[in-house]
Amino acid sequence: KEVVLLDFAAMKGELGWLTHPYGKGWDLMQNIMDDMPIYMYSVCNVVSGDQDNWLRTNWVYREEAERIFIELKFTVRDCNSFPGGASSCKETFNLYYAESDVDYGTNFQKRQFTKIDTIAPDEITVSSDFEARNVKLNVEERMVGPLTRKGFYLAFQDIGACVALLSVRVYYKKCPEMLQSLARFPETIAVAVSDTQPLATVAGTCVDHAVVPYGGEGPLMHCTVDGEWLVPIGQCLCQEGYEKVEDACRACSPGFFKSEASESPCLECPEHTLPSTEGATSCQCEEGYFRAPEDPLSMSCTRPPSAPNYLTAIGMGAKVELRWTAPKDTGGRQDIVYSVTCEQCWPESGECGPCEASVRYSEPPHALTRTSVTVSDLEPHMNYTFAVEARNGVSGLVTSRSFRTASVSINQTEPPKVRLEDRSTTSLSVTWSIPVSQQSRVWKYEVTYRKKGDANSYNVRRTEGFSVTLDDLAPDTTYLVQVQALTQEGQGAGSKVHEFQTLSTEGSANMAV
């Protein structure tokens, strides 16, 4: 932004500048250019020997300026365009200035003036241009400063040129008031802080409803000596509930929200929220809908799922496979997990209790993502009730639970009672028994054995009787032995694992039971 202190051309000849010597040299004249009257100060004493003609401006109030710019528009005639070349003719003039705190009026003293520069034209007006009225306009600019007094004068010294001053414009530069990145920067006088620091750092203030982002830098700009803003640093962002519209922050419209200071616009309230008011930072959930703590505010409100569908319990001897399908209503969430709980009841007494400790699940039962699980180590002659609960991220926000139950009765055999009948260095004779009432249901017995400490291999023998001799064993070696009844329904309960040791080659009649 240029703040003009003096503009000769704009004054249409009304500025009465001082000429010295009076009535000679510089002269105010009017001409017609492009059918418009223009005014100029002109001098053309090119054949009268040495010249020293001065033209002084009126006193100019400095205002806030420290450095001023002087723009001159002028024309200079070619000395060769005059007959005989006009021997004393010059093609330059001198520019001066003087500072003062008061207007000296018509009291003009050359010694008070300091030379700024010799002003020379880039283009001179030759005869053909002059005759054709082609004004060869030169534009020269000079900077003066720092200024310290209340005002100043400019003066133009003619030393024998044929020159016309068409425009004298004096101005200083300001960086204009500016909005940048939602920050307002004040109008700032363009001034170099020092020779090494040609930029003035100016702090901006965030516009209404804008803030400096958390941990970010406040807005800064640099005002150059040329009155231009450079290098923005930092920024402001529209605060929560407001969005950027051009250079301002506007409250979110009803039905929209913005939860944090950011560059993003207000978002439409998501599904299952109540309509927000103007300037909302969030949208409340409808009744029965919730937000998990980790849910972004832009996400729809959700609710707990309904119970799993079609829970089935398939008994397989001492095992049960539980299968179910996903809930019909997921509550609008993908983060569904299932929990399985187990209750056992003794048929004789009707007594019931939890059975998590005595059964074994094929995978941990409390954050299942699959829709099936196998439960083993079930006791015979026991009624089991399994509950499968569907949960999602908002289930913890309500007291009600969504589950489905399935019951199963375990009618499998009791585990066989196993003992060591005999042993040698290379064999073990094992016998077992089960209650007579259950014997009819047993199809065969499965004997599993392996060396203790050897998890990689085991042997299986099947028999219809109640005993088996395990041959080809290693002397003086402990074996792990388990017997399990096989029924039409599948595997029955297995015995506990027994440790039996073969005799050493030295021989001993002692038996380990």
Epitope: M29, S42, S81, S127, F130, R133, V135
Partner: antibody, heavy 128, light 107 residues
Framework: EVQLLESGGGLVQPGGSLRLSCAAS????????MAWVRQAPGKGLEWVSR????????HYADSVKGRFTISRDNSKNTLYLQMNSLRAEDTAVYYC?????????????????????WGQGTLVTVSS | DIQMTQSPSSLSASVGDRVTITCRAS??????LAWYQQKPGKAPKLLIY???NLHTGVPSRFSGSGSGTEFSLTISGLQPDDFATYYC?????????FGQGTKVEIK
């Protein structure tokens, strides 16, 4: 010394035509703006037309526009005025006049010109 | 067009007198004004251009002044050779116009 010598004047009937010439010497003709100025008997001076050093631009007084044509031949150092559709009010002494910007000690040329050098004139009489 | 009005249209003066002739323009012409001298049966001669600039070879007793619409030609000490008719001419417009003339006669 600058010399301008007009010729071609004489008696002509209304509606007739005449061509005036102005022979120049003693200066560089091609540098000068040239003009015709007339003076009716016992009256003041009236500017008629002008032509630039290279043959343009040309300007005419309203009273002669469309009837008179100014021209020049720089190779012959001669200025011309072709006068057609002559009227009684065109009766006057016709002067050829010149202007050299080199002798105009001003920084910016005036909107038009004045006349530094004049010929002795030639009389044109339009009468039936 | 700009009208130029001279006054007086004629005047009688003696040798040595100071004589002033005025010229008024119908609108401002800045200083774009010339003065000419014409003797009977002769061509006009340029005296002054740009209101106050003396043409080469013109005696210094002739001077011009004024700007805008009011101009004057002054002969500071009238000489026998100065008895003639004087014309002003504006050249602020392409339709250059002359005043009607002022005749300076011997008293």
């Amino acid at each position: 010394e600058v010399q301008l010598l007009e010729s071609g004047g004489g008696l002509v009937q209304p509606g007739g035509s005449l061509r005036l010439s102005c022979a120049a010497s003693g200066f560089t003709f091609s540098h000068y703006m040239m003009a015709w100025v007339r003076q009716a008997p016992g009256k003041g001076l009236e500017w008629v037309s002008r032509i630039g050093p290279s043959g343009g631009p040309t300007h005419y007084a309203d009273s002669v526009k469309g009837r008179f044509t100014i021209s020049r031949d720089n190779s012959k150092n001669t200025l011309y005025l072709q006068m057609n559709s002559l009227r009684a009010e065109d009766t006057a002494v016709y002067y050829c006049a010149g202007y050299d910007s080199g002798y105009d000690y001003v920084a910016v040329a005036g909107p038009a010109e004045y006349f530094q050098h004049w010929g002795q004139g030639t009389l044109v009489t339009v009468s039936s | 067009d700009i009208q130029m009005t001279q006054s007086p249209s004629s005047l009688s003066a003696s040798v040595g007198d100071r004589v002033t002739i005025t010229c008024r323009a119908s609108q401002s012409i800045s200083t774009w004004l010339a003065w000419y001298q014409q003797k009977p049966g002769k061509a006009p001669k340029l005296l002054i251009y740009k209101a106050s600039n003396l043409h080469t070879g013109v005696p210094s007793r002739f001077s011009g002044s004024g700007s805008g619409t009011e101009f004057s030609l002054t002969i500071s000490g009238l000489q026998p050779d100065d008895f003639a008719t004087y014309y002003c001419q504006q050249y602020n417009q392409y339709s250059r116009t002359f005043g009607q003339g002022t005749k300076v006669e011997i008293k």
